[in-house]
Amino acid sequence: ELCDDDPPEIPHATFKAMAYKEGTMLNCECKRGFRRIKSGSLYMLCTGNSSHSSWDNQCQCTSSATRNTTKQVTPQPEEQKERKTTEMQSPMQPVDQASLPGHCREPPPWENEATERIYHFVVGQMVYYQCVQGYRALHRGPAESVCKMTHGKTRWTQPQLICTGEMETSQFPGEEKPQASPEGRPESETSCLVTTTDFQIQTEMAATMETSIFTTEYQ
């Protein structure tokens, strides 16, 4: 079952899946000026069994100029901005699959891929949160979210994480700020499942065990 919604937005935090549950789908998308190769795949799917899973198919992009069958609507302004947290500067070091049966590693980058990877997660997927550079974590519990099925509908659990600026007055647990959406857009219109292949981990060592997962696996 696909998780129909995005993992929760936490102000000044990003999230990352350490590995992808079997059944996860990754859209094959290309950056501006590039298209999928002729007869290219629409998506990749994490398939397999409890002992071994891998991504079926692969995504490939080519320059738009080489195809005369394309039409391109002018992108919205937000699509033309520079990559920020979604920058893919280097391939990640994937989590050791031996400890995660039924999961796929992060697919390696493909040439001219889009600035964001759009994953469609399945029930049971877990994502981990950490504060962005310049913010530190205040914890009430695990900084993670799990997609669960309840009453026939999917939902993500709320991560127990507050990210506060160094100079800000620390918030007390329970005094969470309203959840903000990127660029002030309504949550239903924020980019979908923006999970990135490089987290540019520069968070303080004072952050928590969850953060150490990021730094050890991805720095």
Partner: antibody, heavy 115, light 107 residues
Framework: QVQLQQPGAELAKPGASVKMSCKAS????????IHWVKQRPGQDLEWIGY????????EYNQKFKDKATLTADKSSSTAYMQLSSLTSDDSAVYYC????????WGQGTTLTVSS | DIQMTQTTSSLSASLGDRVTISCRAS??????LNWYQQKPDGTVKLLIY???RLQSGVPSRFTGSGSGTDYSLTISNLEQEDIATYFC?????????FGGGTKLEIK
């Protein structure tokens, strides 16, 4: 629950254009591609193209690249397909469908091109 | 483009029967094969995706199998509500293409 709502019928004259809609509900519109499919009686289903509502990125079947134009309006969670220079060959049922493997479909819009 | 062929355009079966509908691709589609059901009123529903994955809410009497270029949909214990036309589709590469459909009727 997930729904894709399409008007039941459209009537247009040869040479004219028509713009049909597909209103999405029950999910976050920008998270999933919207595909369009043509069905004529006694013929195979034909994929026209898709739009990614998040970015307005479109891909078309070569056969329909000069016939169809796909757009999306995020504010109303509605995808549109405009068909131009209509002929009797364009008379068909047109479906919108969601996602990479077409997991939900609209009820279809029957387009009749007649003078 | 990849051609999808459903050699049987119609078939009749009795309630309770086990029915198999086949589909062949003109080239290897790496299991990127989906099955759809179209009811007489035109309603279309995804049954199986990626060869054998049952779509949420679809009864378990529907199963899919196959690999390479040859795929099949099996309906065990046929029910009245299964009367419909069944289409296969490849989503391995653009453009996605459909089989011609197999119309299932009750004897």
């Amino acid at each position: 629950q997930v729904q894709l709502q399409q008007p039941g019928a459209e009537l247009a004259k040869p040479g004219a254009s028509v713009k049909m809609s597909c209103k999405a509900s029950g999910y976050t519109f920008t998270r999933y591609w919207i595909h369009w499919v043509k069905q004529r009686p006694g013929q195979d289903l034909e994929w026209i193209g898709y739009i990614n509502p998040r970015t307005d990125y479109t891909e078309y079947n070569q056969k329909f690249k000069d016939k169809a134009t796909l757009t999306a309006d995020k504010s109303s969670s509605t995808a549109y397909m405009q068909l131009s220079s209509l002929t009797s060959d364009d008379s068909a049922v047109y479906y919108c469908a969601r996602h990479g493997y077409f997991d939900y479909w609209g009820q279809g819009t029957t387009l009749t091109v007649s003078s | 483009d990849i051609q999808m062929t459903q050699t049987t355009s119609s078939l009749s079966a009795s309630l309770g029967d086990r029915v198999t509908i086949s589909c062949r691709a003109s080239q290897d589609i790496s299991n990127y094969l989906n099955w759809y059901q179209q009811k007489p009123d035109g309603t279309v529903k995804l049954l199986i995706y990626h060869t054998s994955r049952l779509q949420s809410g679809v009864p378990s009497r529907f199963t899919g199998s196959g690999s390479g270029t040859d795929y099949s949909l099996t309906i065990s214990n046929l029910e009245q509500e299964d009367i419909a036309t069944y289409f296969c589709q490849q989503s391995n590469s653009l453009p996605p293409t459909f089989g011609g459909g197999t119309k299932l009727e009750i004897k």
